[in-house]
């Protein structure tokens, strides 16, 4: 037989069990279903996530945060994180169209132990696991990362979403559902099955926000606070502990009825003790407060700890570090973790991209470049140093090595280096063509003051970066403007190449520069570049335009410089033409045979409307 005192203890035990039930199992579960991951629409989409034809497989990670904290660096995945299983192995089939990629089976489930916040942020990452012969096992790399902020009520239908990350597209659905006995849009109301006892004990009102009828959701009084109120009968509004008023919107600093955790009612005559340490519930993240003789104690839900349950207990096993961050934590499953973020990311979960250039580290107007692994400053003329902090002197007392000349301008200086040298003082050997500066197959030729590009047919621009007809840039129409049908299509050699070849073949000592102005020679074939007295055909000599066009034909491109009108002609026969500057000198001695011939041995000159010249382009 159970004594009345024992009966009271049992009742209170039942009360506590009901109250702490949400702490021992989740209030609900966020579920994410990935439908497809693959190349998005439009050009430039990747063919396959697998590199170098190695087999690979995908997996996904999701991080959930309450509220609108998608990019808040200080917030961890407070609602939880989950890692999917590995998907089926995929190997790219050469020539096959890019498919939607095989996905892991099942849902990603993130249990949440506190109320569902209604508004949440997500980060979904798609990872690639390469299964080649890597030393040390598979290699992982982040393929795509999407983030968003959404409003979602628990218990609602699946919501569909499409997110794009670069050239990839991710299609997915998500929902939040409550785990019994929790119900409601926030999973905060508890539903008691019909078979459960209807009262906690003799003479006591229900001690937790329980609904009598699980199958028929109650309609509480209009305006009843969904966070702090509940109802047992339709039209009722009963308040959780710490709240009062007809709609449970007024906070009170009192404990209530019998159970330290039980709800109070604004309409019931409960015994009201004085203020206690648990008033206002100091326990965060769904922790339960119990009074102790000196203070209070928080019983924390799984995943949180600390005096007030304020510390997230997500562990490295949950995969909380994003963007390749390294997770470091103790062996104890409940120990905390720290994410060591790669360069360019910060935040407790490495979820926030750092715009390191926003700190404006480059001084004196330098351009900041965030390369991920490092910052670089591209300095304005006249400044140098890792952060452009050095204001360079002018040319006074400054020597440029290896035949370089110092050029002043605006208080700054630079060395204009001779061919093959570079650096601030021209002390470094440099190959200006090493960086492959000519686009679309253009040929690069090193030159006194840099380089010049000989463009492939159909391209133009200082670096051959502009296709003339992009729809068929690699093959011009049957007869490009300025070429007769049947003429061979060739790379047009930039005039500056003459100097380069001359220097290489004959040596600088053999290059006789005859600087004098005279008329057009009859033996055009003996010159590197034949001149023509009539400017009927022009070729743009610095490869700004490598298509020859009939003057006035209106169907070919030309440079912004009018090559038919020298702007300055000095008395020594050196033509100075506006940017890019061109220096033309006559060559008296024939150094080479004609560069190439056309049909039937007919000489086809590289035409230029000045005395036959070797050109260098600045």
């Amino acid at each position: 037989m159970v004594s009345p005192r024992m009966s009271g203890l049992l009742s209170q035990t039942v009360i506590l069990a009901l109250i702490f039930l949400p702490q021992t199992r989740p209030a609900g579960v966020f579920e994410l279903q990935i439908h497809s991951f693959g190349p998005g629409p439009g050009p430039g989409a990747p063919r396959s996530p697998c590199s170098a034809r190695l087999p690979c497989r995908l997996f996904f990670r999701v991080c959930l945060k309450p509220g609108l904290s998608e990019e808040a660096a200080e917030s961890p995945c407070a609602l939880g994180a989950a890692l999917s299983a590995r998907g089926p192995v995929y190997t790219e089939q050469p020539g096959a169209p890019a498919p939607d990629l095989p996905l892991p089976d099942g849902l990603l489930q993130v249990p949440f132990r506190d109320a569902w916040p209604g508004t949440f942020s997500f980060i979904i990452e798609t990872w690639r696991e390469e299964l080649g012969d890597q030393i040390g096992g598979p290699a992982w790399s982040l393929l795509a990362r999407v983030a968003g902020r959404r409003r979602l009520a628990a218990g609602g239908p699946w919501a569909r979403d499409i997110q794009r990350a670069g050239a990839w597209e991710l299609r997915f659905s998500y929902r939040a559902r409550c785990e019994p006995p929790a119900v409601g849009t926030a999973c905060t109301r508890l539903c008691r099955p019909r078979s459960a006892p209807s009262r906690c004990g003799p003479g006591l009102r229900p001690c937790a926000p329980l609904e009598d009828e699980c199958e028929a959701p109650l309609v509480c009084r209009a305006g009843c606070s969904p966070e702090h109120g509940f109802c047992e009968q339709p039209g009722e509004c009963r308040c959780l502990e710490g709240w009062t008023g007809p709609l449970c919107t007024v906070p009170v600093s009192t404990s209530s009825c019998l159970s330290p955790r039980g709800p109070s009612s604004a309409t019931t005559g409960c015994l009201v003790p004085g203020p206690g340490p648990c008033d206002g519930n100091p326990c965060a993240n769904g922790g339960s407060c119990s009074e102790t003789p000196r203070s209070f104690e928080c019983t924390c839900p799984r995943g949180f700890y600390g005096l007030r349950c304020e510390v997230s207990g997500v562990t490295c096993a949950d995969g909380p570090c994003f963007n390749g961050g390294l997770c470091v934590g103790g062996a104890d499953p409940d120990s905390a973790y720290i994410c060591h973020c790669p360069p360019g990311f910060q935040g407790s979960n490495c979820e926030k991209r750092v715009d390191r250039c926003s700190l404006q580290p480059c001084r004196n107007g330098g351009l900041c470049l965030d390369l991920g692994h490092a910052l670089r400053c591209r300095c304005r003329a006249g400044f140098a140093g890792p952060r452009c902090e050095h204001d360079l002197d002018d040319c006074a007392g400054r020597a440029c090595a290896n035949g370089g000349t110092c050029v002043e301008g605006g208080g700054a200086h630079r060395c204009s280096c001779a061919l093959g040298f570079g650096g601030r003082d021209c002390r470094e050997r440099a190959d200006p063509c090493a960086a492959r500066p000519c686009a679309h197959g253009g040929r690069c030729y090193a030159h006194f003051s840099g380089l010049v590009c000989a463009c492939a047919p159909g391209y133009m621009g200082a670096r051959c970066e502009f296709p003339v007809h992009p729809d068929g840039a690699s093959a011009l129409p049957a007869a490009p403007p300025g070429l007769r049908p049947g003429d061979p299509q060739r790379y047009l050699l930039p005039p500056a190449l003459g100097l380069l070849v001359a220097a290489g073949v004959a040596g600088a000592a053999l290059l006789l520069v005859h600087v004098r102005r005279r008329g057009h020679s009859q033996d055009a074939g003996s010159r590197l570049l034949a001149g023509t007295p009539e400017p009927s055909v022009h070729a743009l000599p610095d490869a700004l335009n490598n298509l020859r066009t009939q003057e006035g034909s209106g169907d070919g491109p030309s440079s912004s410089v009018d090559w038919n009108r020298p702007e300055d002609v000095d008395p020594q026969g050196i033509y100075v033409i506006s940017a890019p500057s061109i220096y033309a000198r006559e060559v008296a001695t024939p150094l080479f045979p004609p560069l190439h011939t056309g049909r039937a041995g007919q000489r086809q000159h590289l035409l230029f409307p000045y005395p036959s010249s070797i050109l260098s382009v600045k």
Epitope: L369, A439, A462, R463, E465, F466, S559, S560
Partner: nanobody, 117 residues
């Protein structure tokens, strides 16, 4: 990925003027070579004007002296000032960028210019 958005197209009378703008999403436009192309109905797309990273410009012969290409790196934009417009300038004008870092060309969606009285 560089996104290019053209604006400024529309209907203009022969002899009139129009300025096309192209805004690039990249914050390093000074490292992009930029150009304007056009495509008239039934014709191939063709280069109108281009401007290299060093500021040197190239023009299609038929627009030389009438069109001017310019760039404003601070605004991540390139412009095409079109004067003395003719009926044969009617076309869809496309912005083009060449990304030297990746040897990658990018195209805008195009803006229609109609020259008609």
């Amino acid at each position: 990925e560089v996104q290019l958005v053209e604006s400024g197209g529309g209907l203009v009378q022969p002899g009139g003027s129009l300025t096309l703008s192209c805004a690039a999403s990249s914050s390093s436009v000074q490292y992009l070579s930029m150009a304007w192309y056009r495509q008239a109905p039934g014709k191939k797309r063709e280069l109108v004007a281009g401007i290299s990273t060093d500021g040197s410009a190239v023009y299609f012969d038929s627009v030389k002296g009438r069109f001017t290409i310019s760039r404003d790196n601070a605004k991540n934009s390139v412009y095409l000032q079109m004067n003395s417009l003719r009926a044969e300038d009617t076309a869809v004008y496309y912005c083009y960028a060449y990304n030297w870092s990746y040897a990658q060309p990018y195209w805008g969606q195009g803006t229609l210019v109609t020259v008609s009285s």
